[in-house]
């Protein structure tokens, strides 16, 4: 019951996290700037991974997409890549984890298969969360290092003088959404990995042959001594008595009514 709850909760937390990563990736408010050298009107600029917007106090708003790929800063491309990888891994992880859920029965899927799928999805969620956190952190670092340092540098360029506009760059809402969403996906992934341990059937380190009486007459077949000592052809502990002897694995997988006598 606890395993099912852990797995289910991990799935839900990861689902919320991945939805958040998608939302953050699509949002325009990754960085926000107040262009406060403007004598006319308060101008507010905000930028995302895909487009840049200008909003004025008069109510005018205009957004423009980054339609080029080659000319953009390498850091921006890296952040885009990290976020997309995070989304793709998260989406695949969600798909895998749906089939891995203990509460969902699909054919005769064994617990060991579900455990493996749960672990796979858990690892995918962890990597997805780390990608999102890394992407957001790289962008935040880019803002701090590149922009807060550069205010009012003047130099002469073609066609006259050029100066960097004094702007106050701040972290946009998307950064916080991304950090929280990445964290949730990471936590969900860890929960799935924990649930996987509970789902996996415990394996013994030895293969013991257990003998059970399955009927009134147990017919002896030659080769029994070979199996018990480990000599000869029957080294894999295959069934050597018609109804009586089974390996430990077979006992777990196919219990008969006689096993409980």
């Amino acid at each position: 019951m606890a395993v099912t709850a852990c797995q289910g909760l991990g799935f839900v937390v990861s689902l919320i996290g991945i939805a958040g990563i998608i939302a953050a990736t699509c949002m325009d408010q990754w960085s926000t700037q107040d262009l406060y050298n403007n004598p006319v009107t308060a101008v507010f600029n905000y930028q995302g991974l895909w487009r840049s917007c200008v909003r004025e106090s008069s109510g005018f708003t205009e957004c423009r997409g980054y339609f080029t790929l080659l000319g953009l800063p390498a850091m921006l491309q890296a952040v885009r890549a990290l976020m997309i990888v995070g989304i793709v891994l998260g989406a695949i992880g969600l798909l895998v984890s749906i089939f891995a859920l203990k509460c969902i029965r699909i054919g005769s899927m064994e617990d060991s298969a579900k455990a493996n799928m749960t672990l796979t999805s858990g690892i995918m969620f962890i990597v997805s969360g780390l990608c999102a956190i890394a992407g957001v952190s790289v962008f935040a670092n880019m803002l701090v290092t590149n922009f807060w340092m550069s205010t009012a540098n003047m130099y002469t360029g073609m066609g006259g003088m050029v100066q960097t506009v004094q702007t106050r760059y701040t972290f946009g809402a998307a950064l916080f959404v991304g950090w929280v969403a990445g964290g949730l996906t990471l936590i969900g992934g860890v929960m799935m990995c924990i649930a996987c341990r509970g789902l996996a059937p415990e394996e013994t380190n030895y293969k013991a042959v257990s003998y059970h009486a399955s009927g009134h007459s147990v017919a002896y077949k030659p080769g029994g001594f070979k199996a018990s000592t480990g000599f000869g052809s029957n080294t894999k502990n295959k069934k050597i008595y018609d109804g009586g002897a089974r390996t430990e694995d077979e006992v777990q997988s196919y219990p008969s009514k006689h096993d409980y006598v």
Epitope: V40, N45, L72, P73, N146, V162, T164
Partner: nanobody
């Protein structure tokens, strides 16, 4: 990389009119505010008029009612219609633009043109 080229300056009689143009070209991503500044001989550069991308305009008190600033966002061009010109309007008129570059759409720059001379004299 980016050029602001002013045109339309010249010699005009007091009470006359002139229309200045400023064309921005190069690897521009987005132009925000654009403005006209002037510098008379021996004086400091002063704001004449400025206009935002959305069309909000502001004028220096000395030119209010006489000058009109406008812009064409699709052509990245700024205009200044100057009417009822006076001798004190004689100056080098500079075009100014706050813009992003395509290569760095996260940083804002102010570019200045090299100026066009307006002489108001009889």
């Amino acid at each position: 990389q980016v050029q602001l080229v002013e045109s339309g300056g010249g010699l005009v009689q007091p009470g006359g009119s002139l229309r200045l143009s400023c064309a921005a070209s190069g690897s521009i991503f987005l132009i925000n505010a654009m403005g006209w500044y002037r510098q008379a001989p021996g004086k400091q550069r002063e704001l004449v008029a400025v206009i935002t991308r959305g069309g909000s305009a502001n004028y220096a008190d000395s030119v209010k009612g006489r000058f009109t600033i406008s812009r064409d966002n699709s052509k990245n061009t700024l205009y200044l219609q100057m009417n009822s010109l006076r001798a004190e309007d004689t100056a080098v008129y500079y075009c100014n633009a706050d813009l992003n570059l395509r290569s760095d759409p996260f940083k804002w720059y102010t570019f200045w043109g090299q100026g066009t001379l307006v002489t108001v004299s009889s």
